[in-house]
């Protein structure tokens, strides 16, 4: 049975240029974390797998860095980054959980840096 | 340099046994996940099944759910395949692969021949 | 289960051409999908890994592409040992599922 839940920074935003972390945590749960796959709308970022690591995205090198933790650290943000990001933790024995941001990438420097919503 | 092995085909008849063994070595073989992978002669890729790196995770083919089963030994490096009930479909090439991050097949083995015929 | 449907299932090119193998998945699998070339009597190798990249030690000529349900694997300058047969394969959910090959021949 799945007792676990994951939180994250919900919806954020940042300033176009700049950076941010997207951040979940699952709690909640014993179970082992074996790996977490962060995927960008249908895109596969980067996997943090317990034995092998991490490993980035060879399109997304540049500009995604592993961490803090379980984490990743979005840079040099363009307006083409804003929309839904995924963490998928793969646990055992439980299985699979999944939480979502939003990050909205502004033009301007009215970006609110991990600002915390409510996810619908 | 990654190497993967494969052993134990042959000729069995239906309704026999066969025990598949693949011997890993150049890579540290319990940080990863592996796979069997077959392929009947003139025909396509068909997996099989899969274990995790710690054997906590393991998945089959409905093809062969209730017949095969997949066991890993990380202390002798080794990845094994017990075929049971075996019918005439069963006959393939049979590969094992290592697949980091459970996403792809980046080293496999050169195959071992399975032929289920009276 | 995911279906993997790969066209076309064979066709002729020249050295030097531009080839196009497409994969279309029964269902969304975001970018886990991978390709892999096998040649007559031996084991399958990997070319393109998550849809995009590129395997370490493959030419620079293979690259894949697409997300969701529609991908591509292109050679952009078909050489002589690319002649061969090209598996795509979802890794989205087990159980895992090869399209069923594209054979390149030489015209």
């Known amino acids: 049975m799945m007792t676990g839940t994951i939180e994250t920074t919900g919806n954020i935003s940042a300033e176009k240029g700049g950076s941010i972390i997207l951040q979940c945590h699952l709690s909640s749960t014993t179970a082992q974390v074996t790996q977490v796959n962060w995927e960008q709308q249908d895109q596969l970022l980067a996997i943090c797998n317990a034995d092998l690591g991490w490993h980035i995205s060879p399109s997304f090198k540049d500009r995604v860095a592993p961490g803090p933790g379980l984490g990743l650290t979005l840079q040099s943000l363009t307006v083409n980054d804003t929309g839904e990001y995924f963490c998928i933790y793969h646990t055992y024995p439980d299985g699979t959980y999944t939480g979502r941001i939003f990050l909205e990438v502004l033009e301007s420097s009215v970006a609110e840096h991990g600002a915390r919503f409510q996810i619908p | 340099e990654v190497q993967l092995l494969e052993s134990g085909g042959g000729l069995v008849q239906p309704g026999g046994s066969l025990r598949l063994s693949c011997a890993a070595s150049g890579f540290t073989f319990s940080s990863y996940s592996m796979h069997w992978v077959r392929q009947a002669p003139g025909k396509g890729l068909e997996w099989v099944t899969s274990i995790s790196s710690n054997a906590g995770y393991i998945s089959y083919a409905d093809s062969v759910k209730g017949r095969f089963t997949i066991s890993r030994d990380n202390s002798k490096n080794t990845l094994y395949l017990q075929m049971n009930s075996l019918r005439a479909e069963d006959t393939a090439v049979y590969y094992c692969?290592?697949?980091?991050?459970?996403?792809?097949?980046?080293?496999w083995g050169q195959g071992t021949l399975v032929t289920v015929s009276s | 289960d995911i279906q993997m449907t790969q066209s076309p299932s064979s066709l002729s090119a020249s050295v030097g051409d531009r080839v196009t193998i497409t994969c279309r998945a029964s269902q969304s699998i975001s970018s886990y999908l991978n390709w892999y070339q096998q040649k007559p009597g031996k084991a399958p190798k990997l070319l393109i890994y998550a849809a995009s990249s590129l395997q370490s030690g493959v030419p620079s000529r293979f690259s894949g592409s697409g997300s969701g349900t529609d991908f591509t694997l292109t050679i952009s300058s078909l050489q002589p040992e690319d002649f061969a047969t090209y598996y795509c394969?979802?890794?989205?959910?087990?159980?895992?599922?090869f399209g069923g090959g594209t054979k390149v021949e030489i015209k």
């Open positions: 692969a290592r697949v980091p991050y459970d996403v792809w097949m980046d080293y």
């Open positions: 394969q979802q890794s989205y959910s087990t159980p895992l599922t």
